[in-house]
Amino acid sequence: QSVCAGTENKLSSLSDLEQQYRALRKYYENCEVVMGNLEITSIEHNRDLSFLRSVREVTGYVLVALNQFRYLPLENLRIIRGTKLYEDRYALAIFLNYRKDGNFGLQELGLKNLTEILNGGVYVDQNKFLCYADTIHWQDIVRNPWPSNLTLVSTNGSSGCGRCHKSCTGRCWGPTENHCQTLTRTVCAEQCDGRCYGPYVSDCCHRECAGGCSGPKDTDCFACMNFNDSGACVTQCPQTFVYNPTTFQLEHNFNAKYTYGAFCVKKCPHNFVVDSSSCVRACPSSKMEVEENGIKMCKPCTDICPKACDGIGTGSLMSAQTVDSSNIDKFINCTKINGNLIFLVTGIHGDPYNAIEAIDPEKLNVFRTVREITGFLNIQSWPPNMTDFSVFSNLVTIGGRVLYSGLSLLILKQQGITSLQFQSLKEISAGNIYITDNSNLCYYHTINWTTLFSTINQRIVIRDNRKAENCTAEGMVCNHLCSSDGCWGPGPDQCLSCRRFSRGRICIESCNLYDGEFREFENGSICVECDPQCEKMEDGLLTCHGPGPDNCTKCSHFKDGPNCVEKCPDGLQGANSFIFKYADPDRECHPCHPNCTQGCNGPTSHDCIYYPWTGHSTLPQHARTP
């Protein structure tokens, strides 16, 4: 199917009507599926719109407004999905289609195959010359039982309208027998839960059909309610992971497909990325784009998503000399600084000659997200009330690709600083270190700086800071939980490494094996929280003995094979079918009888759960991904 992007211009149009028509044609010529909204506005009366005959499906809304043409040739439009609605209400909006000072305007809707609006209402009004729209049984087309005020269709705009052909039983899109409205819902047997192709019980369409069908199978649908998988309408596309009943785990499905609009595709179009089995134009803000095996995918960011920003003297900050109040907001949510960070007096204290105010010290917290500086870090000024550089607590790497007089780290004459607090700093890839004349700075002498270096020709000048013996005398020493590797400042979170155990960044005496709110296991010298599916045991007993839901002493909810799970598999996609299980009195999961296709309460075919005329449209996944 040829797919095109829709628009979201509402009623705004190009001032040049010729261009407006050309743009419409360019968008929709040879387009079968409009991924978005189909907006037809400000088109003159003599324009050839026959190219619209190719459109069969619109995922958003259809807007036809402020036009002068006589006939709307959307003859093959079968379904409007209404994933976006006009004015948040209408899937189909047709209004003001006439010329105020003349005889031109919309007379006939050529929507003779429109049999399904999945979401949203219909608004047809103020079309001076329009005929037949008021004969249409819109309730047959609109899927949801929308409030009546959301299906507003005014009576004939013109007194000169003809009647429907007698074979149409009073419902038609135009005057001939070819213009009769095809009813596919209100004429069905009451046992049909959806559409039908005749009045009998045997004439029900498959529940996955939308807009009608030519037969009872999922391959006989005119359109799909959810997804079209190689011609068959399905509730969901073949999932990325399928449940393996032997291993009790979700495993990679090599037959997986991605949802692209209402289609299941083996591969997303080249300008799309995969997000949770869907093809999307861009990753959401909480995810980042990565490439795996040649496929661009959206992966959840562990905390904040990577964002590269220009540093001082680079790109948009090429002419800047220092971080200051006029540019500090450019560093919001940055994780990587391409270039340098420089803090000078005129930045920190302001520059009245250039009308730059002093930095609000609180704003320096923007640097808490920075993990990498590709150039150098130069601190020659800092707010007097800030005693450390903890705003750089997440800085891991200083690249030194650009150096300042051979330096990649420079901290000079900061009398207010008592500790550096670069607690994540692991590497200074190139360049020298120069930390001098910081008369109150302690802890610097506990660190073996050369362990941060990547090359043998890197050097250090750390001089004329607070004397080590003075620091010790005043108790400005590493926390007792730190190892002999030293620390960046006071407290158990500033250690380069731990004497005993660590929980995240913090050094601790011991893990919460047998007590504490959150129970843990020991992975070497690291304390790791037990899986959330493990039941917290009473004090003195281990809650788990390793990672994952298969290492619990006892399950919090249910047990599926060796794994503790939130609930037993209930419609998980297996290799060839959906997997349903029930829980026994011991809360262990067991497979339902093969005849149970919608779940069960026990092991026999008599225990099947039967949901009349409904499908599992969203299938929860409660199994372990390896």
Epitope: Q321, T322, I342, L344, V345, T346, D351, Y353, N354, Q380, S381, Y404, S405, G406, L407, L410, L412, K413, N432, Y434, T436, D437, N457, R459, I460, V461, R463, D464
Partner: antibody
Framework: EVQLVQSGAEVKKPGASVKVSCKAS????????ISWVRQAPGQGLEWMGG????????NYAQKFQGRVTITADTSTSTVYMELSSLRSEDTAVYFC????????????WGQGTLVTVSS | QSVVTQPPSVSAAPGQKVTISCSGS????????VSWYQQLPGTAPKLLIY???KRPSGIPDRFSASKSGTSATLDITGLQTGDEAHYYC???????????FGGGTKLTVL
């Protein structure tokens, strides 16, 4: 006592090179900066470049880039300044001066070396 | 043409006070410490003031200095004939990564 002692006066022809030395004593040579500052007859002071011996790499003023080379020999506590492609405008007194590091004032100066460039 | 400017000359009678100005930009004086040097005829310069307003040991308190924004000043009170010399201000320039000096001011004690 901190001291900087420079080599003697030089007379050079245009196009030639000159190498002036500056021997330091009385302090930890490697972690303090040595800069070269020149003064043409009747003119002001002009910074040419500098080096902190422990770092090894020198920093040069753009004007002299490519023509000047500053090196340090830590075994003899001596810093050298070599200026190539000499022209008559390079006639000046060349001073070495110590600073505690980058961005610091020049607290000790050598006695100066007069370099005359004349054909 | 120096990036830091000083008046070419100033003069005053013995015992009087004289002020020498030094004007630069945010990249040098504005963002860095200013130092002042005295150069007596035929000798090397000598450090007079560092870190905007501090005197090295041995420099009399007749010499004082201050900095405001992108300008600095040197004050000499109780002028003596031995103060007759050239005076230079200096600072690091963060943009150019060089040390810069003012053009120098010749002080004449009348």
């Amino acid at each position: 006592e901190v001291q900087l002692v420079q080599s003697g006066a030089e007379v050079k022809k245009p196009g030639a090179s000159v190498k002036v030395s500056c021997k330091a004593s009385g302090y930890t040579f490697t972690s303090y900066g040595i800069s070269w500052v020149r003064q043409a007859p009747g003119q002001g002071l002009e910074w040419m470049g500098g080096i902190i011996p422990i770092f090894g790499t020198a920093n040069y003023a753009q004007k002299f880039q490519g023509r000047v080379t500053i090196t340090a020999d830590t075994s003899t506590s001596t810093v050298y300044m070599e200026l190539s492609s000499l022209r008559s405008e390079d006639t000046a007194v060349y001073f070495c001066a110590r600073s505690r590091g980058y961005y610091d004032p020049f607290d000790v100066w050598g006695q100066g070396t007069l370099v005359t460039v004349s054909s | 043409q120096s990036v830091v400017t000083q008046p070419p000359s100033v003069s005053a009678a013995p015992g009087q006070k004289v002020t020498i100005s030094c004007s630069g930009s945010s990249s040098n004086i504005g963002n860095n410490y200013v130092s002042w040097y005295q150069q007596l005829p035929g000798t090397a310069p000598k450090l007079l003031i560092y870190d905007n307003n501090k005197r090295p040991s041995g420099i009399p308190d007749r010499f004082s200095a201050s900095k405001s924004g992108t300008s600095a000043t040197l004050d000499i009170t109780g002028l003596q004939t031995g103060d007759e010399a050239h005076y230079y201000c200096g600072a690091w320039d963060s943009s150019l990564s060089v040390a810069v000096f003012g053009g120098g001011t010749k002080l004449t004690v009348l």
